[in-house]
């Protein structure tokens, strides 16, 4: 059976297509090509007489067609108007005609696309951005890429307008991109230049560094403030509520106890109009901000009740500290038999009684810090029960 085949079926505009003929019958008088799905004299492209090997252009001939002795038809420099059906009529020597229809599709060579946007400076968490891939062309597939990857599944991403428009709902600072669109058809593909979003955000709550609270007199106080923000935040400092300066860094040399107080960093974003503050307390003191763990020692840890006495000593190398004692979570002294001496470093119990058995510990502290010793256990024994009514124990 007579058939035709388009080589290629999808043709790029400006290129050429060959309509190949298969199963051409023998004993031919000639053949004719027509534009369309049927034989129509008004739409004849070319006729060919085998006897004379003569090609005769028809009304639909554009001068770009070449017919070959094997009946194949070459069309050069194709346009989108050439898309469609082509019919070959074969005239046999017995004047019985055979027909075959083929087709091809012409697609444009796609230009480099570009991305337009409805909002070049969106505000985080509020604005939506619609990207549109230009130009709009027929029979074209539109694809989008974010960070060189295909679109993730997200309720914040919407495709519309035949995938030509990508909308980001409620943009975040992580949505900067880059964004690219790609257009494809069966004969070509092209990708846009990348576009990035300038997302306005912040300021976030500022952080003041370093984190130290305690400083010694004579030291230099150097504080730095940072808040994530786009555009970058403008900073100002207040000390105890009084404005000091509009800088990111605050430096005070040779501080004294008078520099103690609340230090406020104020961050402002002039575009979003938002402000955030952080307050840090600074304490300037000779006192050690970290009190070492004291050691507790006992003259004896096992004593005889109503007979022995015991001395407990709390040792520390820190100066400017105070000491307090605890027994079974109660503050001491708790009876006439307990005495504190040597600046509370020593706790004396005389005499020791049964109720004094248990866990003791001491705590050293200054106005800004404290620390506790490990506990020590005092055991109280009774060698014999006291005699009553002249009777011996037993």
């Amino acid at each position: 059976q007579l058939t035709t085949e388009s080589m290629p079926f999808n043709v790029a505009e400006g290129k050429e297509v060959l309509l190949l003929v298969h199963n051409l019958p023998q004993q031919l008088f000639g053949y004719s090509w027509y534009k369309g799905e049927r034989v129509d004299g008004n739409r004849q492209i070319v006729g060919y007489a085998i006897g004379t090997q003569q090609a005769t252009p028809g009304p639909a001939n554009s001068g770009r067609e070449t017919i070959y002795p094997n009946a194949s038809l070459l069309i050069q420099n194709v346009t989108q108007n050439d898309t469609g059906f082509y019919t070959l009529q074969v005239i046999k020597s017995d004047l019985v005609n055979e027909e075959a229809t083929g087709q091809f599709h012409v697609y444009p060579e796609l230009p480099k696309p570009s991305i337009s946007s409805n909002n070049s400076n969106p505000v985080e968490d509020k604005d939506a951005v619609a990207f549109t891939c230009e130009p709009e062309t027929q029979d074209t597939t539109y694809l989008w890429w974010i960070n060189n990857q295909s679109l993730p599944v997200s309720p914040r991403l919407q495709l519309s307008n035949g995938n030509r428009t990508l909308t980001l709902l409620s943009v975040t600072r992580n949505d900067t991109g880059p964004y690219e669109c790609e257009i494809q058809n069966p004969v070509s593909a092209n990708r846009s230049d990348p576009v990035t979003l300038n997302v306005t955000y912040g300021p976030d709550t500022p952080t003041i560094s370093p984190s130290d609270t305690y400083y010694r007199p004579g030291a230099n106080l150097s504080l730095s403030c940072y808040a994530a923000s786009n555009p970058p935040a403008q900073y100002s400092w207040l000390i105890n509520g009084t404005f000091q300066q509009s800088t990111q860094e605050l430096f005070i040399p040779n501080i004294t106890v008078n520099n103690s107080g609340s230090y406020t960093c104020h961050a402002n974003n002039s575009v979003t109009g938002c402000n955030r503050t952080t307050v840090k307390t600074i304490i300037v003191t000779e006192l050690s901000p970290v009190v070492a763990k004291p050691q507790i020692k006992a003259s004896k840890t096992t004593v005889t009740g109503d007979k022995d006495s015991v001395n407990l000593t709390c040792s520390t190398n820190d100066t400017g500290i105070s000491i307090r004692w605890f027994f079974k979570n109660q503050s001491l002294p708790s009876s006439e038999r307990m005495k504190l001496s040597q600046g509370n470093t020593t706790l004396s119990i005389n005499p020791v009684k049964r109720e004094d058995a248990g866990t003791y510990w001491c705590e050293v502290f200054n106005p800004i810090s404290k620390n506790q010793s490990d506990p020590i256990m005092l055991n109280v024994n009774y060698n014999a029960l006291p005699q009553e009514n002249g009777l011996s124990p037993g």
């Epitope: 409805n118 509020k126 939506a128 549109t132 519309s160 428009t165 709902l169 109009g273 938002c274």
Partner: antibody, heavy 121, light 107 residues
Framework: EVQLVQSGAEVKKPGESLKISCKGS????????IGWVRQMPGKGLEWMGI????????RYSPSFQGQVTISADKSISTAYLQWSSLKASDTAMYYC??????????????WGQGTLVTVSS | DIQMTQSPSSLSASVGDRVTITCRAS??????LNWYQQKPGKAPKLLIY???SLQSGVPSRFSGSGSGTDFTLTISSLQPEDFATYYC?????????FGQGTKVEIK
């Protein structure tokens, strides 16, 4: 039920100031934008601007920038439109409307009943 | 600013008629077009959002289509309560802009 209730009609003289209100209820007032739309007598609709009550972010139409001030008080779920010095050409019906989810790519799905402002000497 | 042009500015129709109103944007607005209905002395009411999505509670005789620059509002069978003025509005970019309106009157 979502409702936007606007303050009543006003008759003012040129040069006077005015602040009209729009109170939202039945939804999270701070999560939606509130837009203002002007309709002059016998004319079409004109978008004036929009505010996000959550943080008072405001966007104006260039035609109305500097002519009016849009504000909001989220503690009482109310948006405002104000003039510092009225002109006779400000005579119109003013509508507030709820916008979602952004200042753009949105729709105005609920409208107030309108406030008629008449400026005449 | 994006200009929105509606046509016709007014039309006369009978109950049961199929009515079509068109709206053209001065630049591509993707599918970010809304349609509103306004009756005399009343606030506008949202009918269609995002070019073709029917707002909750709006009768199905209203439909919208189009993308890019050309959009259409269709009322498949006009009812007595549909006589009103219809506005298109783009929400692609600020300032949001409305068409000049189309008044649908009783023939």
């Amino acid at each position: 039920e979502v409702q936007l209730v606007q303050s009543g009609a006003e008759v003012k003289k040129p040069g006077e100031s005015l602040k009209i209100s729009c109170k939202g209820s039945g939804y999270s007032f701070t999560s939606y934008w509130i837009g203002w739309v002007r309709q002059m007598p016998g004319k079409g609709l004109e978008w004036m601007g929009i505010i996000y009550p959550g943080d008072s972010d405001t966007r104006y139409s260039p035609s109305f920038q500097g002519q009016v001030t849009i504000s909001a008080d989220k503690s009482i779920s109310t948006a405002y439109l104000q003039w510092s010095s009225l002109k006779a050409s400000d005579t119109a019906m003013y509508y507030c409307a709820r916008g979602y989810p952004a200042p753009t790519v949105n729709d105005l799905d609920y409208w107030g009943q309108g406030t008629l402002v008449t400026v005449s000497s | 600013d994006i200009q929105m042009t509606q046509s016709p500015s007014s039309l006369s129709a009978s109950v049961g008629d199929r009515v079509t109103i068109t709206c053209r944007a001065s630049q591509s607005i993707s599918s970010y077009l809304n349609w509103y209905q306004q009756k005399p002395g009343k606030a506008p009411k949202l009918l269609i959002y995002a070019a073709s999505s029917l707002q909750s509670g709006v009768p199905s005789r209203f439909s919208g289509s189009g993308s890019g620059t050309d959009f259409t509002l269709t009322i498949s069978s006009l009812q007595p309560e549909d006589f009103a003025t219809y506005y298109c509005q783009q929400s692609y970019s600020t300032p949001l802009t409305f068409g000049q309106g189309t008044k649908v009157e009783i023939k």
